[in-house]
């Protein structure tokens, strides 16, 4: 899986979209989980409605909401009032029994609010983020990282 970067501004809302094959995942509930570190387990944050037919209903856990367009094949997660500690690695998952398939790996990046950080230089406003070499911009607030794109010898 590629990792897609979604950038959000502290204090604002961030919407993460996870497209999937609606036929392949027909009848499956979805979930949003947070990975502990780079290689740790993924802890469930929120999941769609227990009744798959009601997956379009928005479900909240704290400041995180999830809703699923099962016909269009798009899972949408909203992080409201984004905070620095919301930054991290996440996954969109498709659930079947006790198993979970990863739909998309997501890196949520929290950027400083230029209005709050008056000592910040190069003031910017949310827009198209830079893409890494050989990576494509998914849409205005995301970019993809190819896993293994940045080679590391075993060893910030």
């Amino acid at each position: 899986h590629n990792t897609t970067v979604f950038q959000g501004v502290a204090g604002q809302s961030l919407q993460v979209s996870c497209p999937y094959d609606s036929m392949k995942h027909w009848g499956r509930r979805k979930a949003w989980c947070r990975q502990l570190g780079e290689k740790g387990p993924c802890q469930r944050v929120v999941s769609t409605h227990n009744l798959w037919l009601l997956s379009f209903l928005r479900r909240w856990n704290g400041s995180t909401a999830i809703t699923d367009d099962t016909l269009g094949g798009t899972l949408t997660i909203t992080l409201r009032n984004l905070q620095p500690h919301d930054a991290g690695l996440y996954q969109c998952q498709s659930l079947h029994g006790s198993e979970a398939d990863t739909l998309r790996k997501v890196l949520v990046e929290v950027l400083a609010d230029p209005l709050d950080h008056r000592d910040a230089g190069d003031l910017w406003f949310p827009g198209e983020s830079e893409s890494f070499e050989d990576a494509h911009v998914e849409h205005s607030i995301s970019r993809s990282l190819l896993e293994g794109e940045i080679p590391f010898p075993p060893t910030s």
Epitope: Q7, E38, P84, L89, L107, E109, D119, D122, S129, S156
Partner: antibody
């Protein structure tokens, strides 16, 4: 093991330039916000500049704005600090610091620092 | 910018003592406060972030507390290896460090 190794420091005359480098290893560099923090001899810590994971967003303290440029090369896993128009008050040990995944609000790992001395 | 004032600037204590270090902000910090330990000739080391979250691998004798503008780092029982300078650091508005508290042996 996370490693950050600063280089490029040294003695430089006021008004001149210097470029610091910080190759990183032991983690997926492109996942992390990065920063430079400095410490003048026998003084406290002072945040200098931060950069987002992709390098598209940068932040500077007022006293270095327009003179210093933070950048990164994710293909080379390296953080840089280009320092121009150096002043005597820029004399300090410069630390390369790693933020957390997706942010450079706080710094979880630091290099050992490189000393920059600005003097005529 | 938020200014951070640490007190005392120098603290003498004995091994086994309960030690309390203070950090006061010029504005509300919203719990976005971290504590760093720096030993002589070494790079700073993160101990605590978001006021009271202990970094993995940091001994449990270290704890953080506070809210608003007033924050505290507590060492429940001082060890000799804890002798160092401690800096508070806020990331609520801008990024600023306190002036530091040097902890020395009495």
């Amino acid at each position: 093991e996370v490693q950050l190794v600063e280089s490029g420091g040294g003695l430089v005359q006021p008004g001149r330039s210097l470029k610091l480098s910080c190759p990183a290893s032991g983690f997926t560099f492109s996942y992390y916000g990065m920063a430079w923090v400095r410490q003048a001899p026998t003084k406290g810590l002072e945040w200098v500049a931060s950069i987002s994971t992709g390098g598209g967003n940068t932040y500077y303290r007022d006293s270095v704005k327009g003179r210093f440029t933070i950048s990164r090369d994710n293909a080379k896993n390296t953080l840089y600090l280009q320092m121009d128009s150096l002043r005597s008050e820029d004399t300090a040990t410069y630390y390369c610091a790693r933020g957390d995944i997706g942010t450079a609000y706080w710094f979880t790992y630091w290099g050992q620092g490189t000393l920059v001395t600005v003097s005529s | 910018n938020i200014q951070l004032t640490q007190s005392p600037s120098l603290l003498s204590a004995s091994v086994g003592d309960r030690v309390t270090l203070s950090c006061k902000g010029s504005q509300n910090i919203n719990n976005y406060l971290a504590w760093y330990q720096q030993k002589l000739g070494e790079a700073p080391k993160l101990l605590i972030y978001k006021t009271n979250s202990l970094l993995t691998g940091i001994p449990s004798r270290f704890s953080g507390s506070g809210s608003g503008t007033d924050y505290t780092l507590t060492i429940s029982s001082l060890h000799s290896e804890d002798l160092a300078t401690y800096y508070c650091y806020q990331y609520n508005n801008g990024w600023t460090f306190g002036g530091g508290t040097k902890l020395e042996l009495k």
